[in-house]
Interface confidence: medium
Amino acid sequence: RKAVLDCEAMKTNEFPSPCLDSKTKVVMKGQNVSMFCSHKNKSLQITYSLFRRKTHLGTQDGKGEPAIFNLSITEAHESGPYKCKAQVTSCSKYSRDFSFTIVDPVTSPVLNIMVIQTETDRHITLHCLSVNGSLPINYTFFENHVAISPAISKYDREPAEFNLTKKNPGEEEEYRCEAKNRLPNYATYSHPVTMPSTGGDSCPFCLK
């Protein structure tokens, strides 16, 4: 009974629930993650335990520092939910659930170009499609390494399309597209497609 009273005697603001977090919330399979279990009370020696659903994963002690659990997310069921327990003597509190979002990375997109040539202009249609990767996918088109379109979000497995009209250029121009989904710091690019300068029959993409 004394242990229970000791725990009850601890005011909620003295020993609140711990916080479970990760710098990385959106992950791909096989990715390493660090989970941080922290507590507002920096003066107590706290024993932290990490759980996935009801499975106990590990325990460590700490004082003033967050507990750090290093995991690898290899299967879908390892996305969570995770929970952290902070314990001092017989008094324990649990964090809120934390779950990762598993996202398949985008594969390199394919860029297709269609051109309608007139005497003065080129009407260019760019199509970009990544056949693999979790939706939605954001596509951005580039000309000579400069973005020429806003991010175009596709919620289905359909190519993104971007139209532009250019005065018949005297120089070659290189186009490529970028595909990106919710995975942070993970973008893929298409192979560049070079549009030759005008002159003669040098427009392989043109519809005459």
Partner: antibody, heavy 121, light 111 residues
Framework: EVQLVESGGGLVQPGGSLRLSCAAS????????MSWVRQAPGKCLEWIGT???????YYASWAKGRFTISRDNSKNTVYLQMNSLRAEDTAVYYC???????????????WGQGTLVTVSS | DIQMTQSPSSLSASVGDRVTITCQAS??????LAWYQQKPGKAPKLLIY???TLESGVPSRFSGSGSGTDFTLTISSLQPEDFATYYC?????????????FGQGTKVEIK
């Protein structure tokens, strides 16, 4: 049964290099951080470094730059690469498993039998 | 880094004696301390962790106490198989570092 078996020790000349291996069995290496600890003849235990479950490495200040810990989870093996060896590196080298899962903040529940490294010309 | 200081460095005792070994950390480590026993030519064996928790299979004559900077390993009634060297070890981590530090050892010899 949990077992750790070190290998790769032997005689090496000053300035030379050596790679020690620690083969683990009876548990999945991917869930445990691992450390290397050494003991010079008649001396105390000395922590060299630790590799976490996500391959972050931590070293004693004297070991940084000369010693490198790595792991191959597919082979269930941990390695210690030692470069620019000196006579004072002569010791028995142990690999040790940290007890708690997924953390480097732990104690050593399992040790290998050790492998002797002698640095001498 | 934290330094661990053990005392005494050696002691002579008889079977049945009560033996106490102390370990002092250069700064507070809470209860992040373990005790090991090592016999000649063998690897260390874990006895106590979290300063006072007895490892499974270790005889109850071994006990640990202390927190902060001062720790004690006690053998309540020394047995012939207890003659060995004992080490304390602190373990510490933060988001940027992780390290272990051992004491210099206490050799328990037969009187």
């Amino acid at each position: 049964e949990v077992q750790l078996v070190e290998s790769g020790g032997g005689l090496v000349q000053p300035g030379g290099s050596l790679r020690l291996s620690c083969a683990a069995s009876g548990f999945s290496l991917s869930s445990h951080a691992m450390s290397w600890v050494r003991q010079a003849p008649g001396k105390c235990l000395e922590w060299i470094g630790t590799i976490s479950t996500i391959d972050t490495t931590y070293y004693a200040s004297w070991a940084k730059g000369r010693f490198t810990i790595s792991r191959d989870n597919s082979k269930n093996t941990v390695y210690l690469q030692m470069n620019s060896l000196r006579a004072e590196d002569t010791a028995v080298y142990y690999c040790a498993r940290l007890s708690e899962l997924y953390t480097t903040n732990s104690y050593y529940s399992r040790w290998g039998q050790g492998t002797l490294v002698t640095v001498s010309s | 880094d934290i330094q661990m200081t053990q005392s005494p460095s050696s002691l002579s005792a008889s079977v049945g004696d009560r033996v106490t070994i102390t370990c002092q950390a250069s700064e507070s480590i809470g209860s992040l301390l373990a005790w090991y026993q090592q016999k000649p030519g063998k690897a260390p064996k874990l006895l106590i962790y979290r300063a006072s928790t007895l490892e499974s299979g270790v005889p109850s004559r071994f006990s640990g106490s202390g927190s902060g900077t001062d720790f004690t390993l006690t053998i309540s009634s020394l047995q012939p198989e207890d003659f060995a060297t004992y080490y304390c070890q602190s373990y510490h981590y933060s988001s940027s570092s992780s390290y272990a530090a051992f004491g210099q050892g206490t050799k328990v010899e037969i009187k």
